[in-house]
Each structure stands twice: as C-alpha cells, then as structure tokens.
C-alpha cells in the first residue's frame, strides 16, 4: 500500500467561451481508495478555490459553469490525489479560456446539385454555426472546413471555406454518391468534430467540361 501516484490534468475545453471543463488522469491508486480534488486560483488572486462541479463533465473532471468562466483571465489549477498513505499533486496547469475553445460541429448541413443553364453545374453546400456560439457579439470568428469524397473512396478532398457558411464545388465525378462533412474552429482554439455526413448523388449528366 502506497500513496497515490501523480495525477495529470491532460485536457481543458470550452464549447463557447462561456463554460469550460478540465479532465485529469489519475496516477496509480497505491492499492487504496483515493480521493481527488481540483483547486485553482485566477492569475493575480491570492485565494484558492475548489472545483465548483465535479459531476457535469463525468469522471475525473471539473466543470466551470458560466458563473466561473472569465475571459482574458488565466486560471492556475492543480489536482490533489489523497489516500490513507499520503497525497500527491499534479503539475500546475495554466488555462486561458480564449485558447481552449472547441465548438460543437456546425449544424443543418445541406447539399444540393445546381445545374444552371448558362453556367457549369456545381455542388452547393450550406450550413449553420453551432447553436452555443454567439457570433453577434463579435467575440467569435469561426472558420470552416469542408471535406467530401465518393462513398467508396479512401481519400477525402478538403476545402477551406474561411468564415462563409456556404461553398461551391465544381469538380466532381458524375454518377458518384458523395459524403460531405463540415467542421469549424474559432480564431484561437481547436477544430470541432466533423458534422454528421450528408450524402448526395451526383447525376450522371453532371459535366465538368466548359
């Protein structure tokens, strides 16, 4: 029977700059029941606070609701593991919410084949930003990426859409069924997961010629 091994805070993520969650990996338990607590202070603060919510984020997590999420403020946090034989502490982790945003995937992905009489046909892709993100405040700039491939192909074709929420693709293989997905990322932060795939059948008469 031993004191617990050193825990590690390995990830912090925010869906929208309004809340965030951090997760830790326990060290070895020393063969004894082990309690974990996360304590933190904000940069410039002389007080320590305990994690406000150990439940919402699941096991080995600490969730900071909107009451406890400050922009432009660094949080300095550590996890303490304690059993009957002693304690061990993780390294301190410095967290700035601005840089840990990972949005939900974009919504309402719509894909349509457009065949104007006077111009080349194209694939028209449209989507909406994730609901948790408030773009009106100007706090957020979301960038988008689209990927698509024929159903049986191994390789994805990737297109960067910038800030726009619609995109045209001209070069497609006629008669193929395509999978299309979109994801987003804030100006600082992480790419979201890809949205659920939308399928589109490209007509056989879809021409790539002028």
């Amino acid at each position: 029977q031993l004191p617990p091994g050193k825990p590690e805070i390995f990830k912090c993520r925010s869906p929208n700059k309004e809340t965030f969650t951090c997760w830790w990996r326990p060290g070895t338990d020393g063969g004894l029941p082990t309690n974990y607590s996360l304590t933190y202070h904000r940069e410039g603060e002389t007080l320590m606070h305990e994690c406000p919510d150990y439940i919402t984020g699941g096991p080995n997590s600490c969730h900071f609701g909107k009451q406890y999420t400050s922009m432009w403020r660094t949080y300095i946090m550590m996890v303490n593991a304690t059993n009957q034989m002693g304690s061990s502490f993780s390294d301190e982790l410095y967290v700035d919410v601005t840089y840990i945003v990972q949005p939900d995937p974009p919504l309402e992905l719509a894909v349509e084949v457009k065949q104007p009489e006077d111009r080349k046909p194209y694939l028209w892709i449209k989507w909406s930003p994730p609901t948790l993100i408030d773009l009106k405040t100007g706090w957020f700039t979301l960038l988008y990426e689209i990927r698509l491939k024929p159903e049986k192909a191994a390789e994805w074709e990737i297109h960067f859409a910038g800030q726009q929420t619609e995109f045209k693709i001209l070069s497609l293989h006629p008669g193929q069924k395509y999978l299309v997905q979109v994801r987003c990322k804030p100006d600082h932060g992480y790419w979201s997961a890809w949205s659920p795939a939308t399928f589109i059948q490209i007509p056989s008469d879809f021409t790539m010629n002028d």
């Epitope: 940069e43 603060e45 606070h49 009451q67 400050s70």
Partner: antibody
Framework: EVQLVESGGGVVRPGGSLRLSCVGS????????MNWVRQGPGKGLEWVSG????????NYAESVKGRFTISRDNARNSLFLQMNSLRAEDTALYYC??????????????WGPGTMVTVSS | EIVLTQSPGTLSLSPGERATLSCRAS???????LAWYRQKPGQTPRLLIY???SRATGIPDRFSGSGSGTDFSLTISRLEPEDFAVFYC????????FGPGTKVDIK
Amino acid sequence: EVQLVESGGGVVRPGGSLRLSCVGSGFSFDDHGMNWVRQGPGKGLEWVSGFNWNGGSTNYAESVKGRFTISRDNARNSLFLQMNSLRAEDTALYYCVRGRSGWFNDAFDVWGPGTMVTVSS
Amino acid sequence: EIVLTQSPGTLSLSPGERATLSCRASQTINSNYLAWYRQKPGQTPRLLIYGTSSRATGIPDRFSGSGSGTDFSLTISRLEPEDFAVFYCQQYAGLPTFGPGTKVDIK
C-alpha cells in the same frame, strides 16, 4: 427588480446569538457569490463573510472566525449568517451583498438595505 | 491581509470641479481585483468601478478609474450634487477588504 432584503437584526447582550437572513429576488441567486458586509455606526465598510455560488468553502474575516457561520439555500434564494458569542464591537448595520460573478471575492454589485445588530448589556 | 489606505481623508470641492481620489495597497494587486463604491449619506454603497477601470452598469462616464501595482485612483471629471458622499476602494484579490473611505464634501 433586482433586490436583496435582510432580516433578523436586533438588540442582544454580549455573548448572545442572532441569525440574520437575506432573501434575493429578480435575479438567479445561484449564479452569484454572496457575502455579508457590515458597517459600524459612523464607521467604514468591513467584509465579514462570503462564499461562492455553489456553497463551497466558506470564508471569514479574522474578526469573526469561529463565532460566525455563513450558509445559503439556493432553492429559497436565501443567505444566512449565524452569529454566536457576540461582542460590543459586532454592533453594526449588516448588509447582504451580491458578487458580480460566481465568486464571492468579486466586486459587490447589489446591496441590501441592511439590518441593524446592536450588542449591548 | 491586504490593507488599503485612502487619501485624502476629506476632499472639499465645489460642484463642477474635478476630483481625484487615491487608494494605496499594502502589497501589489492585480488590476482585475480593485473596485470603487460611492455611499451617499443614509444610503447603501453603490458599485461605481470594478477591475480598476470598468464602469458598473448605469454609472455615468464622469467616473473613471486607473492605476496598477499598489497605486490606484478614481477620477470624477465634474462633481454633481450626488457625488458629495463617501467613496471606498475595495480589493478582492484575496479576502475582500475596503479602504477607510474618502469623504467628498462641499467647499
């Protein structure tokens, strides 16, 4: 309208006890850290006690530590201060005060009108 | 405990004049954690400034805050009748503490 209303003040002998209550309305009580601040007659402001919205660790000024106990009931939008072993120097107007955020140690943006506590023999 | 000292203790000025109030801390305070309040006679304190320089909701722009480290100030560009009151600074980097107050009275 956002407001806090205190009650429970009164006159008590040294060594006696009182329980102050505060009820909040017009805002989501459990989104904010809450505090008690007092002001002696003709004196300045003194922070007494506070804690974060989730009722985590309680915090006290040295002058009241071990004698006063803060508690809250978010379901009833209520904050309490149990005051034991009262002394003459605890005589003051006691304000219930809201922190701007979930932390008690924040700027205090809503103040109740106060309830007067007088400790006298 | 972080001790705050305010100066002057009393400031005698006329309506329309500019007032500068000082608050000094016994140790360095991060500017995110300093606030100013006004307390009119017989009334509860009102938050004016938080985070050293951010005006609270509904506070007119004649109030401005500045400073860093251990020295902070509140400036009232033109005194209105309701500004003849006591002003307190407060730090909340640690357990909250208030300064002793500066009284602004009519000259």
